[in-house]
Every structure is written in structure tokens, then in C-alpha cells.
Interface confidence: low
């Protein structure tokens, strides 16, 4: 058998519909036809049931330590900061996110067989999950950076400005998010398990594109940018000042970015390279696209455990969630009150003192 | 491994009929089309019919009123019904599948050709 790779729109479009007088029956079959055998993708049987696994273990997770944080941070109204409610927010995109995941991991084995209606609410769910947590860590950026470096309280003070800011971080990731709301549906192809999957019609690629830097831009790179200003000129000041206490006070919120960034920033390098590859700029092979799609896969993974990896770093890092957890549990009598650490304070992961308000 | 099996050529006197059949299998995502291109040895290939997945079909004119394609999705496999065969219709018969996969972000188009099934019209 000989197998020949096809990669031109004109003869595509011939192939899909356009009437067949427009070509000439006689002549050889264009070059790129004889040159490349297809590209078919991989096949990762192997890998699946290792991605379920992973599924579960973020889903449970995910579930018991944002459930947790979430829990805390309401319980500990008298001195929640500003930094809590994005915190809060940011345990709440988790928290729905995580919801999805087993529905993800049945679709690994089985193909996408929940229907249109659920691959765009559970694909919505994921992105705005993604497109939250990056706006929010920037928030927290902002809140810190106003706090430390301009030793201001403007935000602080004003609940429901932080309120405002949390709603439309909301609408905007909802808005980044629109994309998939309209274009994903189940593609059912012939033997191949049912896809949730893009679909623009005939200009699917090009629409892609454009749907894909849109967000890349605006909900990955902009936030990013913003965060490294901020902690940029935050570090700058908590060093120059000799702040130690406060110096303290910023690793809850390092570690929440870092891990952040370790997580997701690959995963949109990937992303990168693909529309890199797919507008031309990178030249494209079978290979590379091949192994740009295993990378895909790999650094999807990356940033789905990210949604239980927050609550990991409260519990080990931030000192104030132990003690509101531990007060939450000696309240219902779960633990005794002896068993409370002396400076133990309602606030879960900030207390404010001055004109800054500090987050441990 | 995806296939493309042609079967159903041979020697066939000529004003007789003959019924091609190709089969596609393997993994191969969605079906675009499936159509027949014909090779006379030393000349260029040039193609005879096409079926489409939306239900179009188009003939090569100088095969018009004596050749049908048809095609049954659920077996992946396309028919030429060759009626009234000429002489000049001698060549050899190959099967064609232009296919979608999808993964990730990514559709790719794929085409698959088969080894070819020969068709002899003898005046």
C-alpha cells in the first residue's frame, strides 16, 4: 500500500465539495501527495489509565484541601484581608474545576461520551478555572506590591472595591472562556472514540488561531507580566527595608505563584509552540506535531494537578490556615482547646498591622 | 496500521461491467472522502470518481453515464460500478481516502492510497 500525505487547502476543499470540473482529470497528482506518508497521532493506550489515576488523586485532593480552605477562610471573618478573598476565590475555581475531573478521566477511557451540553460546561469549567487563578494570583500581586512598596491600605479598606475586583475577574475569565462555551461540541468520527472538541465549521483552523492567542495574550502573558512587576519591586523593598517579619509574611504567596507558574507555564510554552507551528513561523513535521501533542498531553497534566496543590502549600508553608484549622476543629470538639497554639488568631493567612497588610 | 483493500478487478471483455470495492480500516478518524483515480502505465494518473462525506458524488467526464461510485459508511468502503467498459478504460484502479483525525487542538488530514487493482478490457 502507498501512503501519501496531503497538507494543501485547495485540494482539500476539492475533496470536501468543490465540483470536480474545475480540475484536470489527466494531470499527476500534486508533489505533496507523494513526498510524506500521513501523520497519524500517536496512540497513548499505554499512558491513559496512568492519567486516571492521576485524575482521582488531584480530584480527592482537591476536593478535601480546597473544601478545607474555603472553610477556614469563612470561619475567620474578624481579620480575613484582602489577599483571603482572592485566596478564597482562587480555592473556589479549584474547588469547581475539580468537580469536572472525574468526567475528564472517564473520557480518557472511553471517548467523550457525555454529549455536547456537559463538553461545553466541563471544558468552560476548566478554562475559567485557569483563566481565574492567573487573574487572581495578579490581584494578590497588585494588593501586595500597593501594601508593601506604597505602604497602602486604599484596598483594604474598601471591602467592596476587593468585591468588584473578585466579580469581574469572574465576567472576564467567563469572557476568555467564551470560545469554548461556542465552538466545543462531541465530534463523532468513524472508528475513533467521540471527541469534545473545536468546531468552527470550515475555517476551523484560522478561527483556532485566533481563539487561541486571544487568551494566550490577554489571560496568560498580560498576568504574568503584571506579577513579575509587582513581586519584582516587592522583593526590591522587603530586601532593602530588611523586612524579615514581612519578608516571612510573602512566602505563602511566592510559593502560590511559583507553583502557579511551574505548573501552567509549561503547558502554554506547548501551547506556544503549536500555534507557532500551525501559523508557520516553527516549520511543521510530522514529529515535531507529534511530539508537540505528547507534550500537550504531558503538560496538561501539570496544570490539572495545580488545583490541589494550593491547599498544600497553606497547610505546609502558611502557619496562620494550621492554627484556623486547628481552632475550626477544637470549636466543633474535635481536638482540645489546650492543643491550640498561644498566638493562634482568626485570620487565616493575613493580619494587618500599619499600613500593610501581611500574609503569611 | 490504517488499509485501503481494493478488490473485484480483472479481464473483462469489452461493453461488460465490472464492480470495484475498496475498504478502508484501522484508526482513522472521520472519512472526508473516498474516491478512484486510474494509472495507464507510463502515462499520469487521473481521476475517475469521488464520493463525498456529505453525500455529493462527481464523475470524470469521460467516464460519465457508464461508471457509479457509491459508497457504504457504516463498512468504510466505496463501490465503482464500471458499465460498458471500453478498451481505453485498461488501467490499473486505485483507491483513495482523504481522512480527519483529531487530537488535541489539532485535525490532521490525512490520505491513503491502495496498491491498485487492474482492469483489463479486451476488444
Known amino acids: 500500500m502507498e501512503d501519501f500525505n496531503m497538507e494543501s487547502d485547495s485540494f482539500e476543499d476539492f475533496w470536501k465539495g468543490e465540483d470536480l470540473s474545475n480540475y484536470s482529470y489527466s494531470s499527476t497528482l500534486p508533489p505533496f501527495l507523494l513526498d510524506a506518508a500521513p501523520c497519524e497521532p500517536e496512540s497513548l493506550e499505554i499512558n491513559k489509565y496512568f492519567v486516571v489515576i492521576i485524575y482521582a488523586l488531584v480530584f480527592l485532593l482537591s476536593l478535601l484541601g480546597n473544601s478545607l480552605v474555603m472553610l477556614v477562610i469563612l470561619y475567620s471573618r474578624v481579620g480575613r484581608s484582602v489577599t483571603d478573598v482572592y485566596l478564597l476565590n482562587l480555592a473556589l475555581a479549584d474547588l469547581l474545576f475539580a468537580l469536572t475531573l472525574p468526567i475528564w478521566a472517564a473520557s480518557k477511557v472511553n471517548g467523550w461520551i457525555f454529549g455536547t451540553f456537559l463538553c461545553k460546561v466541563v471544558s468552560l469549567l476548566k478554562e475559567v478555572n485557569f483563566y481565574s487563578g492567573i487573574l487572581l494570583l495578579a490581584c494578590i500581586s497588585v494588593d501586595r506590591y500597593l501594601a508593601i512598596v506604597h505602604a497602602t491600605r486604599t484596598l483594604t479598606q474598601k471591602r467592596y472595591l476587593v468585591k468588584f475586583i473578585c466579580l469581574s475577574i469572574w465576567g472576564l475569565s467567563l469572557l476568555l472562556a467564551l470560545p469554548v462555551l461556542l465552538f466545543r461540541r462531541t465530534v463523532y468520527s468513524s472508528n475513533v472514540s467521540p471527541a469534545c472538541y473545536e468546531d468552527m465549521g470550515n475555517n476551523t483552523a484560522n478561527w483556532r488561531m485566533l481563539l487561541r492567542i486571544l487568551p494566550q495574550s490577554f489571560g496568560f502573558i498580560v498576568p504574568l507580566l503584571i506579577m513579575l512587576f509587582c513581586y519584582g519591586f516587592t522583593l526590591r523593598t522587603l530586601f532593602k527595608a530588611h523586612m524579615g517579619q514581612k519578608h516571612r509574611a510573602m512566602r505563602v504567596i511566592f510559593a502560590v505563584v511559583l507553583i502557579f507558574l511551574l505548573c501552567w507555564l509549561p503547558y502554554n510554552l506547548v501551547l506556544l509552540a503549536d500555534t507557532l507551528m500551525r501559523t508557520q513561523v516553527i516549520q511543521e513535521t510530522c514529529e515535531r506535531r507529534n511530539h508537540i501533542d505528547r507534550a500537550l498531553d504531558a503538560t496538561e497534566i501539570l496544570g490539572i494537578l495545580h488545583s490541589c496543590l494550593n491547599p498544600l502549600i497553606y497547610a505546609f508553608i502558611g502557619q496562620k490556615f494550621r492554627h484556623g484549622l486547628l481552632k475550626i476543629l477544637a470549636i466543633h470538639g474535635l481536638i482540645s482547646k489546650d492543643s491550640l497554639p498561644k498566638d493562634s488568631r482568626p485570620s487565616f493567612v493575613g493580619s494587618s498591622s500599619g499600613h500593610t497588610s501581611t500574609t503569611l | 496500521e490504517v488499509k485501503l483493500v481494493e478488490s473485484g478487478g480483472g479481464l473483462v471483455q469489452a461493453g461488460g461491467s465490472l464492480r470495484l470495492s475498496c475498504a478502508l480500516s484501522g484508526r482513522i478518524g472521520s472519512i472526508n472522502a473516498m474516491g478512484w483515480y486510474r494509472q495507464v502505465s507510463g502515462q499520469q494518473r487521473e481521476l475517475v470518481a469521488v464520493?463525498?462525506?456529505?453525500?455529493?458524488?462527481d464523475i470524470a467526464d469521460s467516464v460519465k453515464g457508464r461508471f457509479t461510485i457509491s459508497r457504504d459508511n457504516g463498512k468504510n468502503t466505496v463501490y465503482l460500478q464500471m458499465d460498458s467498459l471500453k478498451p481505453e478504460d485498461t488501467a490499473v484502479y486505485y483507491c483513495?481516502?482523504?481522512?480527519?483525525?483529531?487530537?488535541?487542538?489539532?485535525?490532521?488530514?490525512?490520505?491513503?492510497w491502495g496498491q491498485g487493482t487492474q482492469v483489463t478490457v479486451s476488444s
Open positions: 483513495y481516502a482523504h481522512t480527519s483525525s483529531y487530537s488535541n487542538w489539532r485535525v490532521y488530514n490525512n490520505d491513503y
Open positions: 464520493s463525498r462525506s456529505g453525500g455529493s458524488t
